[in-house]
Amino acid sequence: QQQTLPKPFIWAEPHFMVPKEKQVTICCQGNYGAVEYQLHFEGSLFAVDRPKPPERINKVKFYIPDMNSRMAGQYSCIYRVGELWSEPSNLLDLVVTEMYDTPTLSVHPGPEVISGEKVTFYCRLDTATSMFLLLKEGRSSHVQRGYGKVQAEFPLGPVTTAHRGTYRCFGSYNNHAWSFPSEPVKLLVTGDIENTSLAPEDPTFPADTWGTYLLTTETGLQKDHALWDHTAQNLLR
């Protein structure tokens, strides 16, 4: 006999990276008939929602109107049907950005390289941080971690046309509190025409996660898109 219900899905809309003082919605999708959902934050109960009517709703949304460093961290949710509770969802890492300062991103030997060349990004931030994050724009938001007192280097190795795209970096004050994003650096990788045509910027995930993040940054608009990013989420753990 089943002792627990299947775990729900959890994600953040429009993005798990939230500029401070902006809003974010945490979504939890369980089953029709669930009478209560609980959102937990760092192991403590954060919020409760009781859908009405439960038999017609399988997803709830928890609204955070004013993101700050106290609310950055790991979230999970559970739901209840009758007296039976579900397994907890996977962890959602909610990150607050635009904290303190703006790093500088540079690339060596330069932003225009030939396929096969070795490329290194440098992210510099003079304030107290030792962890840096390099993100490539696009749905998959490829994230790399680097460490250093005021600067981290991110060697990409011999590049291919798949490395083409726009990069930004963050300084990280802890796993869930990041600086303002750096100015973007666009990497152009030239190769033979055949390869170039077969290598769009981000072939696996064409939807633009970064665009959604920028929309949040600039206007605070909410978008009803499930853009939770597994690549970056896993890297945070």
């Epitope: 403590s44 109960l45 954060f46 409760v48 609204y63 609310m71």
Partner: nanobody
């Protein structure tokens, strides 16, 4: 901007009752989830009770369940905390808090979620 003003605190004997009120200014009260927290001398602020924006769903700390009742009157922009069977351990400064705006059924338990706070009202329970 939301301003919250608590009232109704005072001294009461064990087993007695009090009703706290929290008056909210501004037109946003109907879109606010509300909560009560308390802080006893030398202790951390703790959750007491909360109520959702629209349907009036409620949630209580185990320590007050069955003794305290939270309610709201959207016409009066006021949230109430009816406290009965009071005990010495209920002695604390009671704070009203709001999350504005929010979805209809959300009930917030964690203090970090609340973006507006009142100044507090003191409740003392002693013989």
């Amino acid at each position: 901007e939301v301003q919250l003003v608590e009232s109704g605190g005072g001294e009461v004997q064990p087993g007695g009752s009090l009703r706290l009120s929290c008056a909210a200014s501004g037109r946003t009260f109907a879109s606010a989830a509300m909560g009560w927290f308390r802080q006893a001398p030398g202790k951390e602020r703790e959750f007491v009770a909360a109520i959702s924006r629209s349907v009036g769903d409620t949630y209580y700390a185990d320590s007050v369940k069955g003794r305290f009742t939270i309610s709201r009157d959207n016409a009066k922009n006021t949230v109430y905390l009816q406290m009965s069977s009071l005990r010495a351990e209920d002695t604390a400064v009671y704070y009203c808090a709001a999350v504005v705006p929010t979805y209809g059924n959300n009930i917030y338990v964690h203090s970090a979620a609340y973006n507006y706070w009142g100044q507090g009202t003191l409740v003392t329970v002693k013989p």
